[in-house]
């Protein structure tokens, strides 16, 4: 087990906080929630602390709870591939680029870490180039959101992990937005990290609404699953 | 634990002002968001106004907004609710809430720890 994987024995309270420019529409996004690393589990709720989101809430998803990747539940014998919970407490930084097929893309830099007892996401995001009647800026997404596998490689030479996903966001009228995703994480502090073989995260998320909130927001259940690397053989041969 | 109380509630006339404030003893304070909801008889238990931890962001329900004022001083575990140009409708229980957690929700669900409410008539 490494020294950060013990902070995540147990449920582990989140708080996200986003600043974001999309072509010049500037917002803020505050959410909190928790982690159980145990099983994988995310639960969060979002608003949107300055009125309208400007752009649709799945669009965000992945910046917001695929921002904290160490919640993901690896199995026993995968444990020593999970980048993202040896660098805690310390942290990494999680930098994007989204390109919107068709549109515009965003750009994201997160840092995320133990703030007390707490996991803190904290993500500056620049969105340019978006067609002001297009899917995103025009609001034509479904409130829904895919299952997706997140794929992993290590970059030795940063000390860190490369990302790359291609998100399916469902349209209105029943086609797809893709979203390609290339995603570095670094960590933020000098003591040592793992570096995975290569594998994926399966990921399973649910957007819904609560009914009694009057801000516009996002409630969000999410499942993350490491797989993609088999046992070893003497794992087969006890 | 946090606990909470209301006081300031009472009789006031239809155009009158009233402040309402709520004390809070327990863990630090600014870890919490408020938030306070009002009852009416036979009424649903709805928000009226929230402040953040920070005290950096409020919200407010349409039915006050421009007249209601929400505010926090976390040196001395105190929120306020400055109400003004009162109205016959306002008249209800006020009270006081907190939620673990520094993110403003209006939501009821999301608030765990509760006064007992100070009476406001109008």
């Known amino acids: 087990m490494s020294k950060g994987e013990e902070l995540f024995t147990g449920v582990v309270p989140i708080l996200v906080e986003l600043d974001g420019d999309v072509n010049g529409h500037k917002f803020s996004v505050s959410g909190e929630g928790e982690g159980d690393a145990t099983y994988g589990k995310l639960t969060l709720k979002f608003i949107c602390t300055t009125g309208k989101l400007p752009v649709p809430w799945p669009t965000l998803v992945t910046t917001f709870s695929y921002g904290v990747q160490c919640f993901s539940r690896y199995p026993d014998h995968m444990k020593q591939h999970d980048f993202f919970k040896s660098a805690m407490p310390e942290g990494y930084v999680q930098e994007r680029t989204i390109f919107f097929k068709d549109d515009g893309n965003y750009k994201t830099r997160a840092e995320v870490k133990f703030e007390g007892d707490t996991l803190v996401n904290r993500i500056e995001l620049k969105g340019i180039d978006f067609k002001e009647d297009g899917n995103i800026l025009g609001h034509k997404l479904e409130y829904n959101y895919n299952s997706h596998n997140v794929y992993i490689m290590a970059d030795k030479q940063k000390n860190g992990i490369k990302v790359n996903f291609k998100i399916r966001h469902n349209i209105e009228d029943g086609s797809v937005q893709l979203a390609d995703h290339y995603q570095q994480n670094t960590p933020i502090g000098d003591g040592p990290v793992l570096l995975p073989d290569n594998h994926y995260l399966s990921t399973q998320s649910a957007l819904s609404k609560d009914p009694n909130e009057k801000r516009d927001h996002m409630v969000l259940l999410e499942f993350v699953t490491a797989a993609g690397i088999t046992h070893g053989m003497d794992e087969l041969y006890k | 634990q946090v606990q909470l109380v209301e006081s300031g509630g009472g009789l006031v006339q239809a155009g009158g002002s009233l402040r309402v404030s709520c004390a809070a003893s327990g863990r630090t304070y600014s870890d919490y968001a408020m938030g306070w909801f009002r009852q009416a008889p036979g009424k649903e238990r709805d928000f009226v106004a929230g402040?953040?931890?920070?005290?950096?962001?409020?919200y407010y329900a349409d039915s006050v907004k421009g007249r209601f004022t929400i505010s926090r001083d976390n040196a001395k575990n105190t929120m306020y609710l400055q109400m003004n140009s009162l109205k016959p409708e306002d008249t209800a229980v006020y009270f006081c809430?907190?939620?673990?957690?520094?993110?403003?929700?209006?939501?009821?669900?999301?608030?765990?720890?509760w006064g007992q409410g100070t009476q406001v008539t109008v």
């Open positions: 809430a907190a939620r673990t957690g520094t993110v403003l929700f209006t939501s009821r669900v999301d608030y765990r720890y």
């Open positions: 402040i953040s931890g920070s005290g950096g962001d409020t």
